[in-house]
C-alpha cells in the first residue's frame, strides 16, 4: 500500500457515507431508532460513534488534500515552521494510560475541541469535492462538544476561546499564500485526527465506555444530531 507521510492509506476506502451514499444531515438520522431490535445507545456509546464518524470524515478530507498537493510528503520539520497553536494532548492532561484522570482529561478534551472550532471554520471552502464533508465534520464536532459538556462535572474549568482572537486568527490564516494555506489545511487535519484519537482512547478508558452495541459497525458511521442528545 502506498501511504502518505503520516501513515494513512491514500487508497483506503473511507466509509463515511450513509447506506444510500449521502451524508446524513443533522436531525435526519432515524435509522438508530427505526430498527426495533437495536438497543438504544448510551451517551458514551453515542460519543464513541460520533468521534468515529468525525475521524472517517477527516480521513476523506485528508485523502483529497493528499491527492491535490504534496503536503502529505512534507517532513515534520517543514510542518513545524508553520507556527499554528493547535491543541495537543500531553501527559499532564490526564488522558494517557499513565496518570489517567477522568475529570482533568474531560476538561482537556472539551477545551481542545473548542479551540479547534476556529480551525474547522478555516477548513470550510478549502475543499472542492468534499465541501459537504468538511461541513459535516464541523457540525458534528459542535454536537460532540455538547455531548461532552453534558458529561462533564467541572464546566467552570473549561475555557472558551475569545471570539475576537478567533476572528483575527481566521483573517490571518485566510490571508496566507496558496502554499501556506495548503500546509495549514494539512496540518489542521493531521492534528485534529491525532487529538480525536487521543480523546477516543481516553474516553474508552472511562468507566461507562467499555463496550459498544453488537450492531455498531465502523463502516456504518452516521452523523448524530442535536435531537439525538
Amino acid at each position: 500500500d502506498y501511504k502518505d507521510h503520516d501513515g494513512d492509506y491514500k487508497d483506503h476506502d473511507i466509509d463515511y457515507k450513509d447506506d444510500d451514499d449521502k451524508l446524513v444531515p443533522p436531525g435526519e438520522d432515524s435509522k438508530d431508532v427505526a430498527a426495533p431490535h437495536r438497543q438504544p445507545l448510551t451517551s458514551s456509546e453515542r460519543i464513541d460513534k460520533q468521534i468515529r464518524y468525525i475521524l472517517d470524515g477527516i480521513s476523506a478530507l485528508r485523502k483529497e488534500t493528499c491527492n491535490k498537493s504534496n503536503m502529505c510528503e512534507s517532513s515534520k520539520e517543514a510542518l513545524a515552521e508553520n507556527n499554528l497553536n493547535l491543541p495537543k494532548m500531553a501527559e499532564k492532561d490526564g488522558c494517557f494510560q499513565s496518570g489517567f484522570n477522568e475529570e482533568t482529561c474531560l476538561v482537556k478534551i472539551i477545551t481542545g475541541l473548542l479551540e479547534f472550532e476556529v480551525y474547522l471554520e478555516y477548513l470550510q471552502n478549502r475543499f472542492e469535492s468534499s465541501e459537504e464533508q468538511a461541513r459535516a465534520v464541523q457540525m458534528s464536532t459542535k454536537v460532540l462538544i455538547q455531548f461532552l459538556q453534558k458529561k462533564a462535572k467541572n464546566l467552570d474549568a473549561i475555557t472558551t476561546p475569545d471570539p475576537t482572537t478567533n476572528a483575527s486568527l481566521l483573517t490571518k490564516l485566510q490571508a496566507q499564500n496558496q502554499w501556506l494555506q495548503d500546509m495549514t489545511t494539512h496540518l489542521i487535519l493531521r492534528s485534529f485526527k491525532e487529538f480525536l484519537q487521543s480523546s477516543l482512547r481516553a474516553l474508552r478508558q472511562m468507566g461507562d465506555l467499555i463496550s459498544v452495541p453488537v450492531d455498531s459497525r465502523g463502516s456504518e458511521q452516521k452523523l448524530i444530531s442535536e435531537e439525538d442528545l
Partner: antibody, heavy 121, light 110 residues
Amino acid sequence: EVQLVESGGGLVQPGGSLRLSCTVSGIDLSSYDMSWVRQAPGKGLEWVGYIYTDSSTWYANWAKGRFTISRDNSKNTLYLQMNSLRAEDTAVYYCARGSTDYAFDTRLDLWGQGTLVTVSS
Amino acid sequence: DIQLTQSPSFLSASVGDRVTITCQASQSISNELSWYQQKPGKAPKLLIYRASTLTSGVPSRFSGSGSGTEFTLTISSLQPEDFATYYCQQGYNSNDVDNVFGGGTKVEIK
C-alpha cells in the same frame, strides 16, 4: 525500502534488565504508531504495548511497571526497556509499525525480523 | 478486559478446501479487528483489517466478516502457501488487557 531492524537481544539473568532497539529506515518514525509484540518459543503472539504519535504509551497488564516503550525520532529508533526479567519473558521480540483509524485499532502492517531474548541463570 | 477466543486451535485441511476460522470477543468490539498470517520462523503478516478490508497484495481468496463479538476469516480455496498459523487482533480497547491477540489457529496439511 522501508525496514524495521530489532537489536539488543541476548542472554540475561533473571532479575536483570535489557534494552531492545528497533531501527527504522525508509519512513519518518514520528509519523507512525508503533508496537512491540513478543512470541515465546512454540507459543502465540503476545502484545507488549503501543506508542502513539501523540506520545502516549499503552501496555498489556503484565507489562505495566516492568517494560517501557520510548522513541527517539531524531535517531528514527524505537526502544523497549525491560526490567526485572523473568524466565517467562524468554521470547522473540518484534517491533511493528501501525496505522490507526480510530483509537486502538492499530493494524500492524510492517514487522521487523525479531530479536531473541533468553532469560536464564 | 477484552479477550479473544480463536477456534479451532488446530485445523487439518487439503489444498483446495474452504477453510473457516472464527474469533470470538468477550464483549463487542465493533468492527475493530485484524487478521494476521504467520509462517514458522517468520514475522506475522497483516491480511485483513476493519474486520473485512483486505490489505493490498493479499490474494482475494482471503476474506473477513463479522461485527460485534463474532468474526470469521475464510480461505475460499486453500493453497500450499496458506499452511500457517492465523491470529486475530482486537482494536477496540487496549487499556486493562492482557493481550490484544487471539490464541492462534494452526492450519496443517491433512
